[in-house]
Interface confidence: low
């Protein structure tokens, strides 16, 4: 399955929107920084494309879920958030189209299941952190910066997949 060129453009737009969403200075929130343990090894180059697509899909789905909550709506600019949802939704569609085309439809490798679970646990840690910090502006700013970091890493993986085609 060939991810369309518009998919990588959408990824870049998503990062730009995340950057624009910043409301306060991360530097005023240094004490709130947290290591969420992004499972980077699950996004390594050892993956076959069939294994990677569902992991990327899970990553984007979890970002969508995180920013679709009532607490998120209260934290961010509504217009930017709507644009952000649209970009994520389009990327999910692109990845789902790949799955439907047969990529990863065959017996799911255990490694892929483990990777999806690792991504879910990563987002559980983020959600728990937000709850513990009572969804404070600094907590959301720390999470926004973290999602920028992890999303850019997964974007790099998508680009490396394209270049291997």
């Amino acid at each position: 399955c060939d991810l369309p060129q518009t998919h990588s453009l959408g990824s870049r737009r998503t990062l730009m929107l995340l950057a624009q969403m910043r409301r306060i200075s991360l530097f005023s929130c240094l004490k709130d920084r947290h290591d969420f343990g992004f499972p980077q090894e699950e996004f390594g180059n050892q993956f076959q494309k069939a294994e990677t697509i569902p992991v990327l899909h899970e990553m984007i789905q979890q970002i969508f879920n995180l920013f679709s909550t009532k607490d998120s709506s209260a934290a961010w600019d509504e217009t930017l958030l709507d644009k952000f949802y649209t970009e994520l939704y389009q990327q999910l569609n692109d990845l789902e189209a790949c799955v439907i085309q047969g990529v990863g439809v065959t017996e799911t490798p255990l490694m892929k299941e483990d990777s999806i679970l690792a991504v879910r646990k990563y987002f559980q840690r983020i959600t728990l952190y937000l709850k513990e910090k009572k969804y404070s502006p600094c907590a959301w700013e720390v999470v926004r910066a973290e999602i920028m970091r992890s999303f850019s890493l997964s974007t790099n993986l998508q680009e490396s997949l394209r270049s291997k085609e």
Epitope: A19, Q20, R22, D35
Partner: antibody, heavy 118, light 107 residues
């Protein structure tokens, strides 16, 4: 493409001030912080502080507190770093750098050599 | 302030060699560690951010590892264009601090 273009070399006397500019282009200026880092001849890199291009907020290293001022002009997408009460040990190349997020810099200016000599 | 200590301060190597540079922080900095390459008369160039993430456009022979206080930059097979000075930088807390640098020159 992203570019940070700095002003030219300066020679100053001890006790004077210097103002270095950094003009940004190729990205949305207000979305990113600009940091300043200096490097004395043959020495390592030293972080000076940051400027929030959006709000104009700043943060300076304790070492430079009271001597450094960072400002910006959003109409020209330019950030300025002014260092006062110059001494010979301020002789260095001064770099501006665009912060991606969480403190790493993907683009740097070409550097401005400031020489402090009597 | 967090002190960053790089070792070695200089090393001589040949093209094709595997090169390892270490960086130690005076306190835990999680994964807020970045690596830069600098050539004479030029601005630093970002290689690795967040301890192990390869910056876009940087050759895959560069890799970073570590978390907490101990970090490593590895060049798997040194190329002629890799002879330069390498700096680690912590971005865990301000003031952000750099290691003193490791100069890699030709043996």
């Amino acid at each position: 493409q992203v570019q940070l273009v700095q002003s030219g070399a300066e020679v100053k006397k001890p006790g004077a001030s210097v103002k270095v500019s950094c003009k940004a282009s190729g990205y949305t200026f207000s979305n990113y912080y600009i940091h300043w880092v200096r490097q004395a001849p043959g020495q390592g890199l030293e972080w000076m502080g940051w400027m929030d291009s959006n709000s104009g907020g700043t943060g300076y290293a304790q070492k430079f507190q009271g001597r450094v001022t960072m400002t910006r002009d959003t109409s020209t997408s330019t950030v300025y770093m002014e260092l006062s009460s110059l001494r010979s040990e301020d002789t260095a190349v001064y770099y501006c750098a665009k912060e991606v997020f969480s403190g790493w810099y993907d683009y740097w200016g070409q550097g401005t050599l400031v020489t402090v000599s009597s | 302030d967090i002190q960053m200590t790089q070792s070695p301060s200089s090393l001589s190597a040949s093209v094709g060699d595997r090169v390892t540079i270490t960086c130690r922080a005076s306190q835990s900095i999680s994964s807020y560690l970045n690596w830069y390459q600098q050539k004479p008369g030029k601005a630093p160039k970002l290689l690795i951010y967040a301890a192990s993430s390869l910056e876009s456009g940087v050759p895959s022979r560069f890799s970073g590892s570590g978390s907490g206080t101990d970090f490593t930059l590895t060049i798997s097979s040194l190329q002629p264009e890799d002879f330069a000075t390498y700096y680690c930088q912590q971005s865990y807390s301000t003031p952000y601090t750099f290691g003193q640098g490791t100069k890699v020159d030709i043996k």
